[in-house]
């Protein structure tokens, strides 16, 4: 093809020419190309009008092209270019007009390009620029040059992993002249020693990220005090898991936060035991979102009912016991992967709509009732990957629930009553791998709106699937894999008119029967892989519903003998439905073991007696 | 397949091969070398990714003396405000990082352990690299 050795991803639009040892821009790519990836080619030098042949370009990736020189007008003619990526080029010479002609550029990535200063970076005319990423460079001064006043659309400025040590009032002077309240600024991984008090006074930012910046606690404390007067929608403070500088931590380091106006606050990776931190929390009482990630925290009883938090996130923290959580305004609580408190205790969260309590190894003495959470507004509840959860109440007061996940927790008392009877609005239910033994046909009664039911990895009395789905008239997805099933009721699926996907894989079925699927007019996917299917259990195999598009019978134990000839022929007749048909192999007899079922030619003669 | 030696410890010998077509060079150092009976140390990685690292996860396929364990998925980078600094690494950017590790050992039986690490990243998801680690465990060696 004309574009080779490049790869045509979307004809006439997208071409990938990555790592092809090109020394120059290829000339066999269509004029109409919009996305061009030339990364990892030794281009080394970009002269004027280098891309004249591609006037329609919108995205140009020049990562790791060993570019050392970019001449005036190198990108001239690229008036539609919106993204230019220059990551990993050891640029030594950048002409003043290097970026001229880029009248639509919105994203410029100049990460790891040996950039030593923003002052000499010739981008002042790029009025459309929204995102400037100059991370991983050699920039020492945080002074935002005068030309920034032209960049009125700038939303993201990434200066992380540079060499900035000091921030002075004059550095941010230009921000006072422009209404950039939407600017997100990332200064992480700069060795900051000093922020002059007043430097951020009356400056508004959308997001400020300061992670792994400070070598010791006193520096952190004075620098946070230096942020006084800043109004920021989201502030992210702390460290990275693999970039730890602070040996210890105490709450006084964060006292300066009281002098900021913050809407959302996130603290990550601080090795400390935050104890008695009510003063700090009081400073942050009016934020709408509060996150602690990987922070050792003894107790959070200091959270006040009156805090205005609407979203609280506690992830991978250590607690002495499950915290007392009583918060009037909270709408979302994410409490995941925490260590310490092993037993859940009631929370009082009257506005709560979203609750994720997954991956904590918690035991629940009872579940689930409005009284456990103090709310009747709950729509989303994730209790997955916990310990023993004893089902003692059928969700009284939690009738608004739409999403419920118990996977990989150990559910007790599931077959004693209709646990889900109140949940007429539930759309998604996952009880996979919950040690549930279905011994009660009313287990799913009440789930009138349910669309997705995942119950893989459980078991059934006598390994028989009874008529337990009678209420689930809106079900579209059902996973019954790994349930040790051997037989099913012929009417098990009779009410599931909307079912589209049915996973019966990894069970112990020895024969295939199409009869139970006759009432599934919407069925598109049926997976019977990893069973022990040898044959069909009746002579007359009916057709599957006409809607069926994918039938998976791989990794079964097909008996490729004459007595099963009609079944094997039937399988061949379903050829257009079969998924990975080449993995359907004979198990018996031994001389045919491993042979693909579809390639068999079984000619059997009837013995006349 | 060329084997790249990583290190030897008192109870393990670790090496890897590439299990993808690309075989983009990756440098791995472990100090001190992992002891299966339990150890802590630093894993140093030097790598130039061929795609953005954001939303990185590993698929782990572990084989113990030719018995295959179920696939494990380990999410490393979720996409914003991530735990690790390398989650923000872009295609073509040098990743030169040290990650501390510690684990309490469980009693491993003597033998050969294989761990295929499929690194998937980006949106749309594609393979970043694939390494197959060979760990030979000699519980009683000095």
């Amino acid at each position: 093809e004309s574009w080779e050795p490049c790869v045509e991803v979307v004809p006439n639009i997208t071409y990938q020419c990555m790592e092809l040892k090109f020394y120059k821009i290829p000339d066999n790519i269509p004029f109409s190309t919009k996305n061009l990836d030339l990364s990892f080619n030794p281009l080394r030098h970009l002269g004027s009008y280098s891309f004249l042949r591609f006037p329609e370009l919108q995205v140009l990736d020049l990562s790791r092209c060993e570019i050392q020189t970019i001449e005036d007008g190198a990108y001239q003619s690229l008036s539609h270019l919106s993204t230019l990526i220059l990551t990993g080029n050891p640029i030594q010479s950048l002409a003043l007009g290097a970026f001229s002609g880029l009248s639509s550029l919105q994203k410029l990535v100049a990460v790891e390009t040996n950039l030593a200063s923003l002052e000499n970076f010739p981008i002042g005319h790029l009025k459309t620029l929204k995102e400037l990423n100059v991370a991983h460079n050699l920039i020492q001064s945080f002074k935002l040059p005068e030309y920034f006043s032209n960049l009125t659309n700038l939303e993201h400025l990434d200066l992380s992993s540079n060499k900035i040590q000091n921030i002075y009032c004059k550095d941010l002077q230009v921000l006072h002249q422009m209404p950039l309240s939407n600017l997100s600024l990332d200064l992480s991984l700069n060795p900051i020693n000093f922020i002059q008090p007043g430097a951020f006074k009356e400056i508004r930012l959308h997001k400020l990220t300061l992670r792994s910046n400070f070598d010791d606690l006193n520096v952190m404390k004075t620098c946070i005090q230096g942020l006084a007067g800043l109004e920021v929608h989201r502030l992210v403070l702390g460290e990275f898991r693999n970039e730890r500088n602070l040996e210890e931590f105490d709450k006084s380091s964060l006292e300066g936060l009281c002098n900021l106006t913050i809407e959302e606050f996130r603290l990550t990776y601080l090795d400390c035991y935050l104890d008695n931190i009510i003063d700090l929390f009081n400073c942050l009482a009016n934020v709408s979102s509060f996150s602690l990630v990987s922070v050792n925290i003894k107790r959070v009883e200091d959270f006040s009912y009156n805090f205005r938090w609407q979203h609280l996130e506690l992830v991978n923290c250590k607690f002495e016991q499950f915290p007392t959580l009583e918060l009037k305004s909270l709408k979302r609580l994410t409490f995941t992967a925490n260590k310490g408190g092993n037993a859940f205790s009631e929370v009082d969260l009257p506005s709560l709509e979203f609750l994720d309590l997954s991956r904590n190894g918690l035991s629940f003495k009872g579940c689930c009732s409005q009284s456990d959470f103090g709310t009747t507004s709950l729509k989303y509840l994730d209790l997955s990957f916990n310990d023993v959860i004893t089902m003692s109440s059928n969700f009284l007061g939690l009738e608004q629930l739409e999403h419920l996940d118990f996977q990989h927790s150990n559910l007790k008392q599931m077959s004693q009553f209709s646990v889900f009877l109140s949940l007429r609005n539930l759309i998604y239910l996952d009880i996979s791998h919950t040690h549930t033994r279905v011994a009660f046909n009313g287990i799913f009664d009440g789930l009138l709106s349910l669309k997705v039911l995942k119950m893989a990895g459980n078991s059934f009395q006598e390994n028989f699937l009874p008529d337990i789905f009678t209420d689930l008239k809106n079900l579209t997805f059902l996973d019954l894999s790994q349930c040790q099933l051997e037989q099913l009721s012929p009417t098990a699926f009779d009410t599931l008119n909307k079912l589209q996907v049915l996973n019966m894989s990894h069970n112990n079925f020895f024969s295939l029967d199409t009869f139970p699927y006759k009432c599934l007019p919407s069925l598109q996917v049926l997976d019977y892989s990893l069973n022990h299917i040898m044959t069909s259990n009746n002579q007359e195999l009916q057709h599957f519903p006409s809607s069926l598009a994918f039938l998976n019978l791989t990794q079964n134990d097909f008996a490729c003998t004459c007595e099963h000839q009609s079944f094997l022929q039937w399988i061949k007749d379903q050829r257009q439905l079969l998924v990975e048909a080449e993995r359907m192999e004979c198990a018996t007899p031994s001389d045919k073991q491993g042979m693909p079922v579809l390639s068999l030619n079984i000619t059997c003669q009837m013995n006349k007696t | 397949q060329k084997h790249y030696w990583v290190c030897n410890s008192s109870d393990a010998s670790i090496s890897y091969t590439y299990c993808d077509k690309m075989q983009y060079p990756i440098s791995i150092n472990v100090n001190p070398c992992i002891k299966l009976k339990g150890s802590r140390g630093l894993l140093h990685i030097f790598y130039i990714p061929r795609r953005d690292v954001k939303q990185l996860y590993f698929n782990l396929y572990i084989t113990v003396n030719s018995m295959t364990l179920p696939k494990r998925k380990e999410v490393i980078c979720r996409g914003s405000d991530d735990d690790y600094s390398f989650c923000r690494a872009l295609k073509g950017e040098t990743v030169n990082t040290t990650v501390s590790f510690s684990f309490k050992g469980i009693k491993f039986s003597k033998g050969k352990y294989k761990c295929v690490v499929e690194a998937i990243s980006g949106s749309p998801e594609e393979m970043l690299f694939c390494l197959e680690f060979d760990i030979i465990h000699q519980p009683n060696s000095n």
Epitope: F303, E346, D348, S369, Q370, D372, T375 | -
Partner: antibody, heavy 118, light 107 residues
């Protein structure tokens, strides 16, 4: 509207076991919440004794732990208090109550006076 | 356990006067403190939860404040029907504990 009603003997002999029952109407005791006993000696303040959770789990005031039992009869929608080895200091008005999700008590029975005397 | 100390034990007040009752906790309990009113021969009635949140149906003359260890219940303009004993209760941790009570009498 939830209503609670205590019942039981008004007079108990020293060293005997005090037994009280709380009948609940308007809400199932297995449907949610925890169900508490509080007592008040004549002319004195309130003392929390213990509770039974809707799941059947119980917890007690450490000062009474060796003598107290709280159980329930779900078919009758009632829960009971047993306090063994009583003495005169156990003379009090005994209240049953329902705790809300937070640790506060919005619903109380009207109380029943139990006198310990020979 | 957390000890709650109420003061005064007794208060005799004329109608329309302002009444202030204080409750001090032996350790910080954030705002996990609740107030009850108990009239003679009646069971306690919840007035205020979480230090300052009035329960619906409670007259607006009752208000609460405080956080940490020091809390106050205020009756802004005392009425004859307010003659009762008032108790604070901490909901910070089990065992639940009550203050000793403050008896308010109408002069």
């Amino acid at each position: 509207q939830v209503q609670l009603q205590e019942s039981g003997p008004g007079l108990v002999k020293p060293s005997d076991t005090l037994s009280l029952t709380c009948a609940v109407s308007g809400y199932s005791i297995t449907g949610g919440y925890s169900w508490h006993w509080i007592r008040q000696p004549p002319g004195k303040g309130l003392e929390w004794m213990g509770y039974i959770h809707y799941s059947g789990y119980t917890d007690f005031n450490p000062s009474l732990k060796t003598r107290i039992t709280i159980s329930r009869d779900t078919s009758k929608n009632q829960f009971s208090l047993k306090l063994s080895s009583v003495t005169a200091v156990d003379t009090a008005v005994y209240y049953c109550a329902r705790k809300d999700s937070g640790k506060w008590l919005p619903y109380w029975g009207q109380g029943t006076l139990v006198t310990v005397s020979s | 356990e957390i000890v709650l100390t109420q003061s005064p034990d007794f208060q005799s007040v004329t109608p329309k006067e302002k009444v202030t009752i204080t409750c001090r906790a032996s350790q910080s309990i954030s705002d996990h403190l609740h107030w009850y009113q108990q009239k003679p021969d009646q069971s306690p009635k919840l007035l205020i939860k979480y230090a300052s949140h009035a329960i619906s149906g409670v007259p607006s003359r009752f208000s609460g404040s405080g956080s940490g260890t020091d809390f106050t219940l205020t009756i802004n303009s005392l009425e004859a029907e307010d003659a009762a004993t008032y108790y604070c209760q901490q909901g910070h941790s089990f065992p639940l504990t009550f203050g000793g009570g403050t008896k308010v009498e109408i002069k």
